[in-house]
């Protein structure tokens, strides 16, 4: 006869490991007992369990409650056992020694491999600001056994660097993603992808990029100066900018206080029916936590009567 087993049994942490040991004997042969032992190099054999044809399953105190026979139906030539709730410390070499009649004793070894799936964590780097050089956007760390693979999935242009720390029974891998911040990266996803044989599918952690910036300010509303004449209603100036975080707006008049009746509504300055006292230099002040910008415009409210008089003069002059 001969023993049938596996060279390697692989389980994920917390799963049950079936340690196979089947005696393929000739007809009439019987198995008296199967002794299972842990036989790691440099240490003596430590009995795990003894499966006796007459006296049943005996389990070492160190494995009490964790070693069982596979569920029925059972073949009397099958000396396999179940090791419940595998932990990292169970990883190692095991030996099954089968005592048969009349053929004698047989033994076989297998290696139990316990996969420890990683629990990845993603840590954002320092605040990103437009104008910085190469900056850490995020780092991703995953520890497992064997060492996990850590990569990045993103449309953003950047560079990655990885380092690994080996522990006694596992390895921690950290990958960093560096980039040169620009406003176009705002809101873009940066995803850490962790692969490991103990995972059914890759684990993904997504970080949304936030890049602080403030665009140049400009003022709209003066495109057609001729519209700014005495008596005109609904005249307004709008301050244009964008930023992250979203900016706040403030309006002032450079050559004095804002005229009465002028309404400030965020980025918009609304005028009552125009008079010459609305002429002046107006400043839009845009700011966020990152920066501030100013834009100024000169409003010159026209008097239609003066204009028409001038036109008449021009005509008469010709």
């Amino acid at each position: 006869g001969e023993l049938e087993t596996s060279d390697v049994v692989t389980v994920v942490l917390g799963q049950d490991a079936k340690l196979p040991c089947f005696y393929r004997g000739d007809s009439g042969e019987q198995v008296g007992q199967v002794a299972w032992a842990r036989v790691d190099a440099g240490e003596g054999a430590q009995e795990l369990a003894l499966l006796h044809s007459k006296y049943g399953l005996h389990v070492s105190p160190a494995y009490e409650g964790r070693v069982e026979q596979p569920p029925p139906p059972r073949n009397p030539l099958d000396g396999s056992v179940l090791l419940r709730n595998a932990v990292q410390a169970d990883e190692g070499e095991y030996e099954c020694r089968v005592s048969t009649f009349p053929a004698g004793s047989f033994q076989a070894r297998l290696r139990l491999r316990v996969l420890v799936p990683p629990l990845p964590s993603l840590n954002p780097g320092p605040a990103l600001e437009e104008g910085q050089g190469l900056t850490l956007a995020a780092s991703c760390t995953a520890e497992g056994s064997p060492a996990p693979s850590v990569t990045w999935d993103t449309e953003v242009k950047g560079t990655t660097s990885s380092r690994s720390f080996k522990h006694s029974r596992s390895a921690a891998v950290t990958s960093e993603f560096h980039l040169v911040p620009s406003r176009s990266m705002n809101g873009q996803p940066l995803t850490c992808v962790v692969s490991h044989p103990g995972l059914l599918q890759d684990q993904r952690i997504t970080h949304i990029l936030h890049v602080s910036f403030l665009a140049e300010a400009s003022v709209r509303g003066l495109e057609d100066q001729n519209l700014w004449h005495i008596g005109r209603e609904g005249a307004m100036l709008k301050c244009l900018s964008e930023g992250q975080p979203p900016p706040s707006y403030n309006w002032t008049r450079l050559d004095g206080p804002l005229p009465s009746g002028v309404r400030v509504d965020g980025d918009t300055l609304g005028f009552p029916p125009l008079t010459t006292e609305h002429s002046g230099i107006y400043v839009c002040h845009v700011s966020n936590e990152f920066s501030s910008r100013d834009s100024q415009v000169t409003v010159d409210v026209l008097d239609p009567q003066e204009d028409s008089g001038k036109q008449v003069d021009l005509v008469s002059a010709s």
């Epitope: 008296g32 007992q33 032992a37 369990a49 003894l50 006796h52 005996h58 070492s60 005592s99």
Partner: nanobody, 117 residues
Framework: EVQLVESGGGLVQAGGFLRLSCAAS????????MGWYRQAPGKQRELVAG???????RLADSVKGRFTISRDNAKNTVYLQMNSLKPEDTAVYYC???????????WGQGTQVTVSS
């Protein structure tokens, strides 16, 4: 041949405890499996507990959490500590030893355990 001598049996009230000893005439370290069977009047003999030369143990479901089996290699003795005894534990307790796997076991003469209610 292995001679087995049991001791420690007796009469005890329900909830009480006893410790049975089984001294072997040769090193228990070399004995494959040792342990205890019991036989109540009119019933079949049943395995109560066993211990292997490698230190693995077995306890019948009916005694788990109440009985423990241990062994002292220096004294060539196996012990059965019986706590929280019940009237249904009343039986003659026999020590057995299987010196070599597959051989017929050696038996002690038996010791009476009686648990009164």
């Amino acid at each position: 041949e292995v001679q087995l001598v049991e001791s420690g049996g007796g009469l005890v009230q329900a909830g009480g405890f006893l410790r049975l000893s089984c001294a072997a005439s040769r090193s228990v370290f070399r004995i494959n499996v040792m342990g205890w069977y019991r036989q109540a009047p009119g019933k079949q003999r049943e395995l109560v507990a066993g211990i292997t030369s490698g230190g693995s143990r077995r306890l019948a479901d009916s005694v788990k959490g109440r009985f423990t089996i241990s062994r002292d290699n220096a004294k060539n003795t196996v012990y059965l500590q019986m706590n929280s005894l019940k009237p249904e534990d009343t039986a003659v307790y026999y020590c057995f030893a299987e010196a070599v796997v597959g051989d017929e076991p050696y038996w002690g003469q038996g010791t009476q355990v009686t648990v009164s209610s």
